[in-house]
Amino acid sequence: TQHGIRLPLRSGLGGAPLGLRLPRETDEEPEEPGRRGSFVEMVDNLRGKSGQGYYVEMTVGSPPQTLNILVDTGSSNFAVGAAPHPFLHRYYQRQLSSTYRDLRKGVYVPYTQGKWEGELGTDLVSIPHGPNVTVRANIAAITESDKFFINGSNWEGILGLAYAEIARPDDSLEPFFDSLVKQTHVPNLFSLQLCGAGFPLNQSEVLASVGGSMIIGGIDHSLYTGSLWYTPIRREWYYEVIIVRVEINGQDLKMDCKEYNYDKSIVDSGTTNLRLPKKVFEAAVKSIKAASSTEKFPDGFWLGEQLVCWQAGTTPWNIFPVISLYLMGEVTNQSFRITILPQQYLRPVEDVATSQDDCYKFAISQSSTGTVMGAVIMEGFYVVFDRARKRIGFAVSACHVHDEFRTAAVEGPFVTLDMEDCGYNIPQTDESTLMT
């Protein structure tokens, strides 16, 4: 987990479309009541931006204490600031809650850079712009942290939406969403629409801006266009998926597809970048450079360090390629692809040059822990975390940033053989999954 990249702390066989197209499934499976349609009260309930995370308003305790909570599909703890901190406007005051119960147990979560630690307890939790329910959930009251909270981010805690297997201190600590589903009639599914601004936002603009939507218990048709395509959740720990092919401007990277998933591929709203395994990153950057070879950008730009600035409104989007990730489909030997634009992988940075400039960071970076499909990927799509059916759906987001020439896309089906071989089997050791 890396600060600035992993928020809040923290970026042969495989899948050639053979020309043969599989028939599109026309028979929709029966829907559970209330799972689809309109969720007006939840639309636009997120704020923030990809560089500092997207947050939802939650209330904790009795009487309710309102906090902004980072939505993180890459972890499984509900943890909130519970002591004064220079970067926190407010924090959870357990002593003021009549419904707080102490679990008399500590929790310590280290990251590559930074950490948080706290005390476990339970309390009543609700989401004002979410389902009209209150649940008793586990809460880690953060009493000490280092490089965890982000100055100016406007959130005070983190909502880990992944599975119990990666909860800290261990998998016996029930994550919030499990508690929600168990204690209410909310269907075991949520969906995220993260809306990147496409331009830098200053503090007041972020506070006034709409960052997107977290639809708890369903799918809102107004948040996407076209069809939803589903990929299986390989294993219920992180939201792990399998990438079977990668293309830059339609050119296959031609790597063994195992490399794309070494040692895993996850969908993580708490990571800023699209993070790729070292070999894949190097091949992708080489291909992106080749596609934009009329220009030469500084080495530090490709490392995600230097900013490249253009006169406002003149960013040459057309010289940068589109990137397609092919994901394993639900049907045997069938895949689909999601395609993002430079508008997603060049991240606008708050005005550091002049007001006449648009400045960007390259938001694809190297990973030693597998592929992480972070906010820059998710900002192109409406993403459905269908836990009940162990699958993740992608559709083109109604709010994604694009130009008049190109748009993000979700397309399929494609014939892809031996996709199971693309998954990497992690040796079963007692590894510390969060130490990434």
Partner: antibody, heavy 120, light 108 residues
Amino acid sequence: QLQLQESGPGLVKPSETLSLTCTVSGGSISRGSYYWGWIRQPPGKGLEWIGMIYYSGSTWYNPSLKSRVTISVDTSKNQFSLKLSSVTAADTAVYYCARVGHGVSYFDLWGRGTLVTVSS
Amino acid sequence: EIVLTQSPATLSLSPGERATLSCRASQSVSSYLAWYQQKPGQAPRLLIYGASKRATGIPARFSGSGSGTDFTLTISSLEPEDFAVYYCQQVYTWPPRTFGGGTKVEIK
């Protein structure tokens, strides 16, 4: 070793166009690792970046000068050129050409400079 | 706009003394900062890039340090040929167009 040499008129009349050429010797301008830039320095003052060019012809200009500046490259002659239109006395300066190296970020090799005076 | 402020404007020292020049950025530039030396009637010369890396052929008495917003160029023991004007430049935002105003190191 690689050398850069500026050439062009030392005196230009107001409202006319200043034209300078930088000749690169001892190496090819077409080597993809570098941009080639222009910087100027008014008498007794600091350094001001004008702009730069890649061998492909891709250019980057200082926004404050952009409307008046054109930088071009002639790979066959191993030269790149600067044109600055509608000059005034404020454009009087020593003009340097330079190579932008070290990850195309820093001016790691400079010409000796040529003084251009704008006066009628 | 990132502004680079150099101080002092003038530094009066004797040969053999230690010179410490400061460059402060109005916001973080990470380690993307360079130092140039310019002698009268000559073109600038790259001394330090990446905040602390010496350019080819630069003597070891020149060293750069700092990251973020505060940077220092140190000349451990001034030689007669070191009396010149020194400029810093940030390239965190690219293209590389921002220079500091300069510090003149003169003989006391």
